[in-house]
Interface confidence: medium
Amino acid sequence: TEVKVTQPEKSVSVAAGDSTILNCTVTSLLPVGPIRWYRGVGQSRLLIYSFTGEHFPRIRNVSDTTKRNNMDFSIRISNVTPEDAGTYYCVKFQRGSSEPDTEIQSGGGTEVYVLAK
């Protein structure tokens, strides 16, 4: 069966300077390939976090994704700023051998609304 990516919250509100968790779970780790978080859609979308080892300031994974059969790819964004507002998508990719990774499924998106302190 096809992997499903679930973002249970349609929206979250967070005060500037605080942190927020964006939840994302998958039903399967197959096919092999990374999970990445993006803000926005289409050509304007921005890579926010990738579960592939790179360092992303202010963002870290919530659960231990090195554990076997971990299906939780939620992230915590710290010190949120108004510029962080937007819709965040958790996206599952299939790893390519020689060609680029292929995007195969996305969560429904979570709108982050940043409140003034």
Partner: antibody, heavy 119, light 108 residues
Framework: DVQLVESGGGVVRPGESLRLSCAAS????????MNWVRQAPGEGLEWVSL????????YYADSVKGRFTISRDNSKNTLYLQMNSLRAEDTAVYYC????????????WGLGTLVTVSS | EIVLTQSPGTLSLSPGERATLSCRAS??????LAWYQQKPGQAPRLLIY???SRATGIPDRFSGSGSGTEFTLTISSLQSEDFAVYYC??????????FGGGTKVEIK
């Protein structure tokens, strides 16, 4: 059972204002995002505006931005749409629509109220 | 903004026949697509969500399929009450939430 009842429609002249209401019952109103969707005579559906359950997240279609204001009173289980500077192209049946609690599709709709803008 | 294109604009069929309605998205919406039915003078009614899941109380003659940019609503055997206008709606890119232009299923 979920019930959504719109009111406030009528005939107005271009440039005038109108306030639509949607009385909700049969569900926990404050827990659901609510929308206005309109349908011009003989045309398709056009999303107008949405407001989150708490009222703090609001969006508008470009066609109404700056002229329409969505609001809600959770103590009265009522959704509102204040329409200012009305134009002939705003003539439509306006539906109040309740969103699914997880995704932005519409589980329940009101019967609609007709707004006619004509000189 | 994601644009949804429905085809055909009108489908003329007889009761008992199979209806196949198409909805095409300008970019992938994965399976975040809903279908609604609207009869004259009535509000739309949710039929399908998640591209293929039937809403509560919807008969099993209605089925949805597809993912990405191509979607289909199938009515396996048209009943008299099924003659109506059908709209698709995407809820992947939001807002604005967008609807297709509709397909009218009329009696031949």
């Amino acid at each position: 059972d979920v019930q959504l009842v719109e009111s406030g429609g009528g005939v107005v002249r271009p440039g005038e204002s109108l306030r639509l209401s949607c009385a909700a019952s049969g569900f926990t109103f404050s827990s659901y995002d609510m929308n206005w969707v309109r349908q011009a005579p003989g045309e398709g559906l056009e999303w107008v505006s949405l407001i989150s359950g708490s009222g703090e997240i609001i969006y508008y279609a470009d066609s109404v931005k700056g002229r329409f204001t969505i609001s809600r009173d959770n103590s009265k289980n009522t959704l509102y749409l204040q329409m200012n500077s009305l134009r002939a192209e705003d003539t439509a049946v306006y539906y109040c629509a309740k969103e699914n609690n997880r995704y932005r599709f519409f589980d329940d709709w009101g019967l609609g109220t007709l707004v006619t803008v004509s000189s | 903004e994601i644009v949804l294109t429905q085809s055909p604009g009108t489908l003329s069929l007889s009761p008992g026949e199979r209806a196949t309605l198409s909805c095409r998205a300008s970019q992938s919406v994965y399976t975040y697509l809903a279908w609604y039915q609207q009869k004259p003078g009535q509000a739309p009614r949710l039929l399908i969500y998640g591209a293929s899941s039937r809403a509560t109380g919807i008969p099993d003659r209605f089925s949805g399929s597809g993912s990405g940019t191509e979607f289909t609503l199938t009515i396996s055997s048209l009943q008299s009450e099924d003659f109506a206008v059908y709209y698709c709606q995407q809820y992947y890119d939001r807002p604005p939430l967008t609807f297709g232009g509709g397909t009218k299923v009329e009696i031949k």
